[in-house]
Amino acid sequence: DGCKDIFMKNEILSASQPFAFNCTFPPITSGEVSVTWYKNSSKIPVSKIIQSRIHQDETWILFLPMEWGDSGVYQCVIKGRDSCHRIHVNLTVFEKHWCDTSIGGLPNLSDEYKQILHLGKDDSLTCHLHFPKSCVLGPIKWYKDCNEIKGERFTVLETRLLVSNVSAEDRGNYACQAILTHSGKQYEVLNGITVSITERAGYGGSVPKIIYPKNHSIEVQLGTTLIVDCNVTDTKDNTNLRCWRVNNTLVDDYYDESKRIREGVETHVSFREHNLYTVNITFLEVKMEDYGLPFMCHAGVSTAYIILQLPAPDFR
């Protein structure tokens, strides 16, 4: 059939909860392409009916929820004007009850379910939740050894759990939990994460570089919506946190009640030698009190700010 085969690494997943996999393979999927999902070399495509437990949602295959019998090799076929690629994804489903210690250890989990905290540093864990836009995720709760995490050293920020002054006691088994809503139905997502610790700096003490902003002011009209990106380059296995603060407080905490100013979800692009991270700040409505206040982007020890400024009056 003239399609080039590409084999992705195995994904190991937990039964009885939602799972989604996006068929993206840059640069193949960057142009005008059609994507079709199949299971186990079947000639019949995966359903696109949103009521189906397993269905294709744009470029994604979505399981609501995943079941033990869903293990197998799935193919997505990406057809462009002059090209065809078939991507093979091996999904292995296992039954795991995170808090049942009588059940043996986990299988060889994907790397995102194994994370490392750096002793004595401020660090973070990430809850990897990859779902299409049709899935709405609620706030994330974090657990350690099956107990909900509380305490002033821990802060939940979007999909991350910030851990300040990491200690040896922070190692162990964690889980992040969110409620996913799709077509009016709710599902629980629970990701287990094994967390180990190290004293190694890992990234050699490198300092992240904030590309933008550059400690400058931005002219913006009162009442408008404003989104500002903070772009940071850093080494691949850095442990630096990236966030927006005002008055030395995380913006999501500072505007906790009104939610008028929020930090966006961090994204990153991976290059050979470094990563480029983007985390934005959204002003739903700029108010007078926002002017003249430094909004700080933090990335490890690096900081840069923007100051909102009223546009100069136009006397023309």
Partner: antibody, heavy 120, light 106 residues
Framework: QVQLQESGPGLVKPSQTLSLTCTVS??????GYWNWIRNHPGKGLEYI?????????YYNPSLKSRVTISRDTSKNQFSLKLSSVTAADTAVYYC??????????????WGQGTLVTVSS | DIQMTQSPSSLSASVGDRVTITCRAS?????MYWYQQKPGKAPKLWIY???NLASGVPSRFSGSGSGTSYTLTISSLQPEDFATYYC?????????FGQGTKLEIK
């Protein structure tokens, strides 16, 4: 059970490059830290360096100009190259990894070691 | 670099003796790791995070210390304990080992 196995020539000529490979089973080298350590005859242990889960490498500054650690994730192997060797590089070379009790720095799993002699 | 100095360098002792090996760091370290090595064998993790015994290590071994001074203690020496012991730190690179303490039968 994690197992590590060193392989490579046991004899290297002075000024040449020492090359060793560590083959890993029971764990993926895309998690954790993968270390090289050597033991000079009748002397102590010397830390050479590591390659991390992301491919980041760290080298002991005393060897940095001569050492390269790399990996092949498809074969689940990582390698050591030490250039311009002299008799002082004669040692038993070990690969090792940690992760014991969720502590990456606790080197619990070791290869059996391979003796490399530098001699003409 | 943090220099790790073990004392004594060698020690002759008898079965049943209480033995203490000291590791002094030239600067503060957060945790100490100890390894046991027997001739012709790879080192074995013995004590991690200063005071935790690795799997299979007898309870007669203990580890303690903080800052620049750390100790490995054997409460009652047994024949299988005769070996060389190394301390190691990861607080500051390079990740240095002590020169080793060789424990011999008197």
């Amino acid at each position: 059970q994690v197992q590590l196995q060193e392989s490579g020539p046991g004899l290297v000529k002075p000024s040449q490059t020492l090359s060793l490979t560590c083959t890993v089973s029971g764990a993926s080298i895309t998690s954790g830290y993968w270390n090289w350590i050597r033991n000079h005859p009748g002397k102590g242990l010397e830390y050479i360096g590591y390659i991390s889960y992301s491919g980041y490498t760290y080298y002991n500054p005393s060897l940095k100009s001569r050492v390269t650690i790399s990996r092949d994730t498809s074969k689940n192997q990582f390698s050591l190259k030490l250039s311009s060797v002299t008799a002082a590089d004669t040692a038993v070379y070990y690969c090792a990894t940690g992760g014991y009790d969720y502590v990456e720095d606790a080197l619990y799993y070791w290869g059996q070691g391979t003796l490399v002699t530098v001699s003409s | 670099d943090i220099q790790m100095t073990q004392s004594p360098s060698s020690l002759s002792a008898s079965v049943g003796d209480r033995v203490t090996i000291t590791c002094r760091a030239s600067s503060n370290v957060r945790y100490m790791y100890w390894y046991q090595q027997k001739p012709g064998k790879a080192p074995k993790l013995w004590i991690y995070l200063t005071s935790n015994l690795a799997s299979g290590v007898p309870s007669r071994f203990s580890g303690s210390g903080s800052g620049t001074s750390y100790t490995l203690t054997i409460s009652s020496l047994q024949p299988e304990d005769f070996a060389t012991y190394y301390c190691q730190q990861y607080t500051t690179s390079p990740y240095t080992f002590g020169q080793g303490t060789k424990l011999e039968i008197k």
